[in-house]
């Protein structure tokens, strides 16, 4: 059958997925393209706000916030007294932590 994944090569740990009369590659984190041969840049969309730096770690993007900001995407200002504008820390996150 032309639609199955037999002989289909998905590079860099990608998985072949069938459906809709075709097959495609579901790529591992950090890769993209038809055969998962292209490196995907998770930082391309500039996800870290307020001058924060985005790093393309193998586990996904990581933001390192500029001084004065915090949060997963550096979206929350830190008040001068050290408190943040975050109403409450999201589950599993301490205030001041970078989010993964």
């Amino acid at each position: 059958d032309l639609d199955d994944c037999a002989g289909r090569a998905c590079a860099n740990g990608g998985t072949c997925v069938e459906g809709g009369g075709a097959h495609r590659c579901s790529c591992a984190l950090g890769f993209g393209g038809r055969d998962c041969r292209e490196r995907a840049d998770p930082c391309a969309a500039r996800p870290c706000a307020h001058g924060g730096r985005c790093y393309a770690h193998f586990s996904g993007l990581v933001c390192a916030c500029a001084p004065g900001y915090m949060g997963a995407r550096c979206e929350f200002p830190v008040h001068p007294d050290g408190a943040s504008a975050l109403p409450a820390a999201p589950p599993g996150l301490r205030p001041g932590d970078p989010q993964r």
Partner: antibody, heavy 118, light 109 residues
Amino acid sequence: QEQLVESGGGLVQPEGSLTLTCTASGFSFSSSYDMCWVRQAPGKGPEWIACIYTGDGSTDYASWAKGRFTVSKASSTTVTLQMTSLAVADTATYFCARNSGYGYFGLWGPGTLVTVSS
Amino acid sequence: QVLTQTPSPVSAAVGGTVTISCQSTESVYGSDWLSWYQQKPGQPPKVLIYQASNLEIGVPSRFKGSGSGTQFTLTISGAQCDDAATYYCQGYYSGYIYAFGGGTEVVVK
């Protein structure tokens, strides 16, 4: 396979200048990294010098390195470190290293030796 | 930012436990952006632990990192002869600043 290789080291006289080059293979600086320079004097620990963030070209320096050291991106696969007014105390192996998240250097070059002597 | 490590050298028997401490003069970024490296003569440092406690891919599980804020520990459980090396901690700080500890030499007998 991702690799870094430093070049440009050698013998230089005190007050002299030198430019080191770090060449990347297996990846390019189109993704966002801190490409950094770290040095290690004989028998001593590593010492951070400077980084250039490939996302926007911004640079950061150790306080002692400002003014004498300049890091820049020469191409999509090369970073340079310009060193001026070199002193005997600058004798060290100079490493190129990449931070790709969480502030650690997961990829290093083998290093290039810079000897400052008259 | 200054990172102070356990004085060198630290000695351990094969199969024994080695504990190395690292103290920072100020909190590292996110309270856990602290890494540990192993270095052998003639080689660049090799990362063992990142983010205080995450084991780098390919590193044996006998290496364990712990701590947060300003105080961190690297533990080697069941030390092997191959673990004889110098170990460094390295922190990342707000403002995109890096710093290394002075190193701890580990001798395995």
